[in-house]
């Protein structure tokens, strides 16, 4: 992202690059289902995707007031193996329920320091943050 | 996110809230597999999660120079139904391969305007952007 303007003075860009939060309200990013109760190792025939999956999962909240997004959700698998498509409850040892990970871009609020080293408000620091998105039914790896 | 400081002057916060891009280099956020070739409706016994899944998918790039993150990846299912755990190739009509969607927080670059309406560099506008994360093998909905 080196060609994105910084809000610090830099060559070739306006001297004051203010990156302002839009005042447009953004609804919270909640997964379709946050019903952490009555979750078990079974594939439902209705409800949201994470409960109908044969590799069902639940979501756990990760809240950090100094981060954007403040709320992230981590998937947690409810079964070690995949659930049978036929019954929706018995596990099939031929399939593993594995977490799918993603390195998400997040921004942490950090104190900014002016030219003289004094505190000049807050800056954003971009980081990668690993989140688990879902559980996926996969064929186990065959070691060569 | 109303309690996050704005970089515009506001009560209770320092008058100049500069949100600066960190100079820490961030590696590109590429999924483990971007091999768009030799993708087919089968579950492999090796390779990345998206090719071993019984609801396999490929990734498609979404690049926008005016957005952070600039590169996002959308999952695209390779099969309408789930692949049999036994064979890894034949489809099982008892299971559907469905896309899992997520509204991701992204930031668009917009011209900032100073007090007199003149262009004062760039601001960030926070938006929700729908991305498909993965394909999940689910039991079809049973209509009540």
């Amino acid at each position: 992202y080196s060609h994105w303007p910084s809000c610090c003075p830099s060559k070739g860009y306006p001297s004051e690059e203010l990156l302002r939060w839009s005042t447009v309200p953004v609804p919270p990013l909640k997964p379709a289902s946050l019903d952490f109760h009555s979750v078990s190792c079974r594939a439902s025939e209705d409800g949201p995707l994470n409960s109908r999956a044969i590799s069902p999962w639940r979501y756990e909240l990760d809240r950090d007031l100094n981060r954007l997004p403040q709320d992230l959700y981590h998937a947690r698998c409810l079964c070690p193996h995949c659930v049978s498509l036929q019954t929706g409850s018995h596990m099939d040892p031929r399939g593993n329920s594995e977490l799918l990970y993603h390195n998400q871009t997040v921004f942490y609020r950090r104190p900014c320091h002016g030219k003289k080293g004094n505190h000049k408000g807050y800056c954003l620091e971009r980081r990668l943050y690993r989140v688990s998105l879902a559980c996926v039914c996969v064929r186990p790896r065959v070691m060569g | 996110y109303s309690h996050w400081p704005s970089c515009c002057p506001s009560k209770g916060y320092p008058s100049e809230e500069l949100l600066r891009w960190s100079t820490v280099p961030v590696p590109p956020l590429k999924p483990a597999s971007l091999d768009f070739h030799s993708v087919s409706c089968r579950a492999s016994e090796d390779g990345p999660l998206n090719s071993r899944a019984i609801s396999p998918w490929r990734y498609e790039l979404d690049r926008d120079l005016n957005r952070l993150p600039q590169d996002l990846y959308h999952a695209r299912c390779l099969c309408p139904h789930c692949v049999s755990l036994q064979t890894g190739s034949h489809m099982d009509p008892r299971g559907n391969s469905e896309l899992l969607y997520h509204n991701q927080t992204v930031f668009y670059r917009r011209p900032c305007h100073g007090k007199k309406g003149n262009h004062k560099g760039y601001c960030l506008e926070r938006r929700l952007y729908r991305v498909s994360l993965a394909c999940v093998c689910v039991r079809p909905r049973v209509m009540g």
Partner: antibody, heavy 120, light 108 residues
Framework: QVTLKESGPGILQPSQTLSLTCSFS??????????VGWIRQPSGKGLEWLAH???????QYNPALQSRLTISKDTSSSQVFLKIASVDIADIATYYC????????????WGQGALVTVSS | QIVLTQSPAIMSAFPGEKVTMSCSAS?????MYWHQQKPGSSPRLLIY???NLASGVPVRFSGSGSGTSYSLTISRMEAEDAATYYC???????????FGGGTKLEIK
């Protein structure tokens, strides 16, 4: 100073493959955010985007023409290539290469254009 | 696929007159770009990211708009502004750059 210049066969027969070269200077296609695209314009008509290639070798194509197009680059010699398979009279046009990026998705620099004619 | 419709197709203006042309998108777009093309020449970028003036473009040109409605304005028409103007947008996914059909501006 940024310059781009297109070159091609000028004339070719129906069903042949059109090969175009864009030679550029004043920027590097290894710079993050940089891209080079191809746009064509039939005589007296509007502009149509064909394809572009990014600094990291990501290629993107117009879906309507994707099956016939191949874009590639040689960063060291500052060239981008476009091949169009199975040409016919609908492909008669002036072909432009243009730079994209690194900051936005406009085309800030264009080549002078190369006229391509298809005739049996 | 987003379609850009420019209006009017042809227009004319006196020197010194204010000129405004429109570009309507079939669905909402984030940014609009404007190019100027004179006969026998390559297109030239005038406006990027809806309202920013490209390098070397006279300040009499300006762009505005949002959503599906965008416009290019020339505050005072000059003889050298006689040309065809194209609006352009891009969609990041699936990737697609589209141009409007053009507005031909003539000098009276």
């Amino acid at each position: 100073q940024v310059t781009l210049k297109e070159s091609g066969p000028g004339i070719l027969q129906p069903s042949q493959t059109l090969s175009l070269t864009c030679s550029f200077s004043g920027f590097s296609l290894s710079t993050s955010g940089m891209g080079v695209g191809w746009i064509r314009q039939p005589s007296g008509k509007g502009l149509e985007w064909l394809a572009h290639i990014w600094w990291d070798d990501v290629k993107q194509y117009n879906p309507a023409l994707q099956s016939r197009l191949t874009i590639s680059k040689d960063t060291s010699s500052s060239q981008v290539f476009l091949k169009i398979a199975s040409v016919d009279i609908a492909d008669i046009a002036t072909y432009y290469c243009a730079r994209i990026g690194p900051v936005h998705h406009g085309f800030p620099y264009w080549g002078q254009g190369a006229l391509v004619t298809v005739s049996s | 696929q987003i379609v850009l419709t420019q209006s009017p197709a042809i227009m004319s203006a006196f020197p010194g007159e204010k000129v405004t042309m429109s570009c309507s998108a079939s669905s909402s777009v984030n940014y609009m770009y404007w190019h100027q093309q004179k006969p026998g020449s390559s297109p030239r970028l005038l406006i990027y990211d809806t309202s920013n003036l490209a390098s070397g473009v006279p300040v009499r040109f300006s762009g505005s708009g949002s959503g599906t409605s965008y416009s290019l304005t020339i505050s005072r028409m000059e003889a050298e502004d006689a040309a065809t103007y194209y609006c352009q947008q891009w969609t990041s996914y699936p990737p697609m750059y589209t141009f409007g059909g053009g507005t031909k501006l003539e000098i009276k």
